[in-house]
Amino acid sequence: CQGSADHVVSISGVPLQLQPNSIQTKVDSIAWKKLLPSQNGFHHILKWENGSLPSNTSNDRFSFIVKNLSLLIKAAQQQDSGLYCLEVTSISGKVQTATFQVFVFESLLPDKVEKPRLQGQGKILDRGRCQVALSCLVSRDGNVSYAWYRGSKLIQTAGNLTYLDEEVDINGTHTYTCNVSNPVSWESHTLNLTQDCQNAHQEFRFWP
């Protein structure tokens, strides 16, 4: 592939589409290739002949959009960075090429948070009271904040508290929610403690 390359910049984890600007219409076949600098040659990602289905020589991370001859990288990764070449052959044998220099950077934003696991233990106290200790866990807890709710009321906003101690009335209705968030997403988990306190004998545990 010759000529200057279009520069395409993306962050990891998102779809990336390489789309040629203007390609003549009488297309007979196309080939998408990626330069392998170590071998000083091209690796065929995908081939397509007009009237047939695309043959994907790499894997299912790539797909081909026939309508505009684009290559779609379904979830770009850093190793997808490099020089890509589209070679279009017309029915008369003429070859047109389009070249793309792709840069995929690790996102500075975190991944979406996963759903937390809310669990705890409790102890029956005298005078019809129940003491509960709740903990809220996510396996990847970098850069996440925690918020606690009793019913719909926010009761704890210290963003780094993964646990909550409460003393409640045995006969009351008690719903607790842990909300975990980061700059791009949030998830929550809710526990209803009413039955646990009423049915418990001295000490008990409750799980989601």
Epitope: K26, D28, E87, T89, I91, S92, G93, K94, V95
Partner: antibody, heavy 119, light 108 residues
Framework: EVQLQQSGPELVKPGTSVKMSCKAS????????LDWVKQKPGQGLEWIGY????????KYNEKFKGKATLTSDKSSSTVYMDLSSLTSEDSAVYYC????????????WGQGTTLTVSS | DIVMTQSPPIISASLGERVTMTCTAS???????LHWYQQKPGSSPKLWIY???NLASGVPVRFSGSGSGTSYFLTISSMEAEDAATYYC?????????FGGGTKLEIK
């Protein structure tokens, strides 16, 4: 000046093969597709196939698959056509033609190679 | 394959006469994909008109081309002796490219 210089006339026996050449000059060899066209005596024109010296891309008319084989040599700016298992039906003038750069017309024609197949 | 049919097969025209020949495609083609070639006895064909209406280099302006879809025409406004030849139409809208059977233009 663009020129397509074809090899001379051939008189061959049935069942044999022949290889004719077309030497291109006056332009950048790898920038243009070259086609071959057959014309039987007193008849019309028939497309055989093309070769693109840029990437050695080749396509044949279905009718000539197995009959014609196209090759090219960048070092001498020459394309070749092999015709095999010759019969009297192959007796014709064979033209080497250059495909236009923009639209798909044949802008330059060689002088033709006359092939006569006779026992 | 797209079949190209030229009519009439032979035209006898007087010098100075207006001449029109027709090329009909078996299916619709783009006007940019229809071309005409002139061939004289013992010579190679020459590109004469390309993309329906564009005259090739050196072609006299008395020649013109027109048409669209399946019907295309080559016209000579005033026949001259040097125009006597066979004219072939050619499509490269679909592969394989195909030629008409030719119209032989002779002087009456």
């Amino acid at each position: 000046e663009v020129q397509l210089q074809q090899s001379g006339p051939e008189l061959v026996k049935p069942g044999t093969s022949v290889k004719m050449s077309c030497k291109a000059s006056g332009y950048t060899f790898t920038n243009y597709v070259l086609d071959w066209v057959k014309q039987k005596p007193g008849q019309g024109l028939e497309w055989i196939g093309y070769i693109n010296p840029y990437n050695d891309g080749i396509k044949y008319n279905e009718k000539f698959k197995g009959k014609a084989t196209l090759t090219s040599d960048k070092s001498s700016s020459t394309v070749y056509m092999d015709l095999s298992s010759l019969t009297s039906e192959d007796s014709a003038v064979y033209y080497c033609v250059r495909l236009g750069y923009d639209e798909d017309y044949f802008d330059y024609w060689g002088q033709g190679t006359t092939l006569t197949v006779s026992s | 394959d797209i079949v190209m049919t030229q009519s009439p097969p032979i035209i006898s025209a007087s010098l100075g006469e207006r001449v029109t020949m027709t090329c009909t495609a078996s299916s619709s083609i783009s006007s940019s994909d229809l071309h005409w070639y002139q061939q004289k006895p013992g010579s190679s064909p020459k590109l004469w008109i390309y993309s329906t209406s564009n005259l090739a280099s050196g072609v006299p302006v008395r020649f013109s081309g027109s048409g669209s879809g399946t019907s295309y025409f080559l016209t000579i406004s005033s026949m001259e002796a040097e125009d006597a030849a066979t004219y072939y139409c050619h499509q490269y809208h679909r592969s394989p490219p195909t030629f008409g059977g030719g119209t032989k233009l002779e002087i009456k």
